[in-house]
């Protein structure tokens, strides 16, 4: 369950949210801005050569709760943060790669950046 009185099921925003997009701009984006009914995100992950790559964009409401949940993937270093508090809020997200050692927990934190800029943990 999420903290701060949020319900577990994501609810539709009353209005469209604009996000910065980079390496992840859909066809309907304009000037590196995409639109969504869900979340803005910024993600860092290693490419095949081990170089960190930062991607940002929009996540639709459908399935975004799962995608914003930073669940560890075996043999893949990746971190994602999501936000909704204002347009282009993902400009201010700076996720960092998790440490190299194997992580021994299965369910990672939900990385939703909100007004207070703290992470919600289970």
């Amino acid at each position: 369950k999420k903290e701060d009185g949020e319900s577990t099921a994501p609810t539709a925003r009353p209005k469209v949210l604009r996000c910065k997009c980079h390496h992840h701009c859909p066809e309907d984006s304009v000037n590196n801005i995409c639109s969504t009914d869900g979340y803005c995100f910024t993600m860092i992950e290693e490419d095949d050569s081990g170089t960190p790559v930062v991607t940002s964009g929009c996540l639709g409401l459908e399935g975004s709760d799962f995608q914003c949940r930073d669940t560890p993937i075996p043999h893949q270093r990746r971190s994602i943060e999501c936000c909704t508090e204002r347009n282009e809020c993902n400009k201010d997200l700076h996720p960092t790669l998790p440490p190299l050692k194997d992580r021994d927990f299965v369910d990672g934190p939900i990385h939703h950046k909100h007004h207070h800029h703290h992470h919600h943990h289970h």
Epitope: D28, I33, S35, D37, G60, N87
Partner: antibody, heavy 116, light 112 residues
Framework: QVQLQQPGAEVVKPGASVKLSCKAS????????MQWVKQRPGQGLEWIGE????????MYNQKFKGKATLIVDTSSSTAYMQLSSLTSEDSAVYFC?????????WGQGTTLTVSS | DVVMTQTPLSLPVSLGDQASISCRSS???????????LHWYLQKPGQSPNLLIY???NRFSGVPDRFSGSGSGTDFTLKISRVEAEDLGVYFC?????????FGSGTKLEIK
Amino acid sequence: QVQLQQPGAEVVKPGASVKLSCKASGYTFTNYWMQWVKQRPGQGLEWIGEIDPSDRYTMYNQKFKGKATLIVDTSSSTAYMQLSSLTSEDSAVYFCARFGYYVDYWGQGTTLTVSS
Amino acid sequence: DVVMTQTPLSLPVSLGDQASISCRSSQSLVHSTGNTYLHWYLQKPGQSPNLLIYKVSNRFSGVPDRFSGSGSGTDFTLKISRVEAEDLGVYFCSQSTHVPFTFGSGTKLEIK
């Protein structure tokens, strides 16, 4: 009920600027974008741009960049559109409209006449 | 910009008839979220437009069930099952998938 109140008409001289207003009531002003749309007889409807009152974020139709400036006053739940360097081409009806994912409510429109 | 092409420009009907208006877009209106942001409005003389149908087929509150919308991708239709006098005016389709948002040129529904 949702209402968007606009003055009925404005008359201005060529080369001047004008600030059109749109006062919102009946809903939480910051929960929706405000759009502006131009309508000239026989020219259909043209989207000028939109502003999100919660963070004053704007998006413009490239065609109206430099012509229109969108602003809001959240304390009075009023949106404004400033039009500059007016010519006869700017004579039209200008509507404000509430936008979430589509426009659901429109103001009655302000008829702008640019004439010397 | 996405061009919205409406046909016919004028639609003469008798009261009680069915009316059908077509709207085609120059590119797909399916948004990256999966939604299709195609909407229909009616504008009566001297008034602002009124929302009839949003997201292809959803009737806005207070809109009679004789109005229906259908379509997908680039091809959309508004149908009025039995035209009443209050339905006369200019019908516009509109898309809010791609910025800048654009409108059809309008279809004038008039009495035959």
